[in-house]
Amino acid sequence: AFGISGVQKYTRALHDSSITGISPITEYLASLSTYNDQSITFALEDESYEIYVEDLKKDEKKDKVLLSYYESQHPSNESGDGVDGKMLMVTLSPTKDFWLHANNKEHSVELHKCEKPLPDQAFFVLHNMHSNCVSFECKTDPGVFIGVKDNHLALIKVDSSENLCTENILFKLSET
């Protein structure tokens, strides 16, 4: 698993990056776990990074990801007093120069090394869900979310609002 120090070195001063022509609103480090409290971990294997969903041993440190928050350039349909309709998007980076990517063809979630500007596949619309959980919807494929399948992350199509509560697309973010 990546050491936290590597990620902390990577944490940048606010506004010094330009992704899709915009800067992040803010960035911070958090650990990512599933609804069932399994940890999302990252490991270097055969010169590529793998993503695992696993139970950690008692004193094992959780991997951290750098969450970068962006406002969408396109508003949602919601309107009314005070709301401007823009949605909150995130990118997730567990180590320098690597970001989670949605591979819509393979229905997979992968870690890709890339330069800025990041491709749209690295952006996810943030959803609030029940039990203080969040979900991550692909910017490139609305209705498709990051989810857990066979102890790996995968892309899961959600075809109705009732299915939005399915446990395998629910995640917890912890800044501690």
Partner: nanobody, 119 residues
């Protein structure tokens, strides 16, 4: 829907202090990001401070060490303590929340409160 109401603005001398408040009311109870922005006449709106759901706070370069953002979860209120104010801090200050109960996280703005730093 969500209403954000700012208060605490006014006229203050250079070197003085002000405390801004922003109270959120309405049906939204989960906020992912809370922040303060400001806009001076003829300038773009700029980030002053932003706080995450877990309490991590980042500040704009021009206010670091002088401004402090805090919150009171029980009152759904955020604060901006502004010390050592300078004339260049004169602006309309806006409260900014990102939140939702269920579904995509959306952005909300307050109406703004005027801060004037002048002798």
């Amino acid at each position: 829907q969500l209403q954000l109401v700012e208060s605490g603005g006014g006229l203050v001398q250079p070197g003085g202090s002000l405390r801004l408040s922003c109270a959120a009311s309405g049906s939204i109870f989960r906020f992912n990001l809370m922040g303060w922005y400001r806009q001076a006449p003829g300038k773009q709106r700029e980030l002053v401070a932003v706080m995450s759901e877990g309490g991590t706070t980042n500040y704009g370069d021009s206010v670091k060490g002088r401004f402090t953002m805090s919150r009171d979860n029980a009152k759904n209120t955020v604060y901006l303590q502004m010390n050592s104010l300078k004339s260049e801090d004169t602006a309309v200050y806006y409260c900014n929340f990102w939140g939702s109960n269920s579904g995509p996280v959306l952005q909300y703005w307050g109406q703004g409160t005027q801060v004037t730093v002048s002798s």
